[in-house]
Amino acid sequence: PRSIDVKYIGVKSAYVSYDVQKRTIYLNITNTLNITNNNYYSVEVENITAQVQFSKTVIGKARLNNITIIGPLDMKQIDYTVPTVIAEEMSYMYDFCTLISIKVHNIVLMMQVTVTTTYFGHSEQISQERYQYVDCGRNTTYQLGQSEYLNVLQPQQ
């Protein structure tokens, strides 16, 4: 068998809502993956599990099942949404995210995703993790790759 390549493309959109009383931020983050099947037979994308971390705390999880079948030597782009909640011990972020004097309220989130594919009864898991900027202050649609947080990926000077 040839490889199945999973490429995390980035955040596609982030939709924000607030609970004023609870000082809680709700972020629905839609991500984009490219999955390439380099084989001469079809593979099934059985599930995608994803989680989002802020400051080493898991703030959201999602799981998609029976997603699609990718034909031989084909590629499919898949969007998945992770609902996240920034609350409780992180409610201090409410003040930052709701500052009306700041135009872009970027926070750095770690996106983790695991794709499970199956073919001929064989199962394979591919995982990726990436740091991304997300604006927690307004609804935002991103150009693909626009939200990448490069600083984290650079070696220390």
Partner: antibody, heavy 119, light 112 residues
């Protein structure tokens, strides 16, 4: 420390236009909204509008649309207000004021520029 | 536009007295994010306004604790517990919850 230095007083004729500058220093100029406020002699304060130097985005008080145009030059960290078709009603002191991030108020002000419209 | 009404117009005080300025808005100043954007500024003759109190009750850096702000919704008050000579000037309330931002007409704090 934050400083907003405005250009000097202007005496202009009715119907003419004028451009006032406000040079910001001591902070990240591109990342803060710059506001403009009008004060007529012995009168209160009127908010004209604001500009975000990072991308040139503007918000205006409807009363000043067509009268005032706000621009900013990131390279020289200077904000400008252009006032057109001047009348005696435009004679006033014009202030620039930075919108602070955490107090969410106009926490630093220029010294003001006096504009006198007279024939 | 939101109308900000300040009273009194003029406030003669003796040094050491308490002073109280009222500011009323024509509609609620509570933003959808739960914060209330009511600020107070003071302007001395020939100077630009200076921020005194932000978001109802927070003293700006360097502002003495004899200044305090209170209120909610549409009714707000600025108090100076013991007026000093350097406090004399014109006090403005301002709202930035609604566009356009608007100011009160000003209260002149003067010596009796």
């Amino acid at each position: 420390q934050v400083q907003l230095q405005q250009s000097g007083a202007e005496l202009v004729k009715p119907g003419a236009s004028v451009k006032i500058s406000c040079k910001g220093s001591g902070y990240a100029f591109s990342s803060y909204w710059m506001n403009w406020v009008k004060q007529r002699p012995g009168k209160g304060l009127e908010w004209i509008g604001q500009i975000y130097p990072g991308d040139g985005d503007t918000n205006y008080n409807g009363k000043f649309k067509g009268k005032a145009t706000l621009t900013a030059d990131k390279s020289s960290t200077t904000a400008y207000i252009h006032l057109s078709s001047l009348t005696s009603e435009d004679s006033a002191v014009y202030f620039c004021a930075r919108w602070g991030h955490y107090d969410e108020a106009m926490d630093d002000w220029g010294q003001g520029t006096s504009v006198t419209v007279s024939s | 536009d939101v109308v900000m009404t300040q009273t009194p117009l003029s406030l003669p005080v003796s040094l050491g007295d308490q002073a109280s300025i009222s500011c009323r808005s024509s509609q609620s100043l509570v933003h959808s994010n739960g914060k209330t954007y009511l600020h107070w500024y003071v302007q001395k003759p020939g100077q630009s306004p200076k921020l005194l109190i932000y978001k109802i009750s927070n003293r700006f850096s360097g502002v003495p604790d004899r200044f305090s702000g209170s209120g909610s919704g549409t009714d707000f008050t600025l108090k100076i517990s013991r007026v000093e000579a350097e406090d004399l000037g014109v006090y403005f309330c301002s709202q930035i919850t609604h566009v356009p931002w608007t100011f009160g007409g000003g209260t002149k704090l003067e010596s009796k």
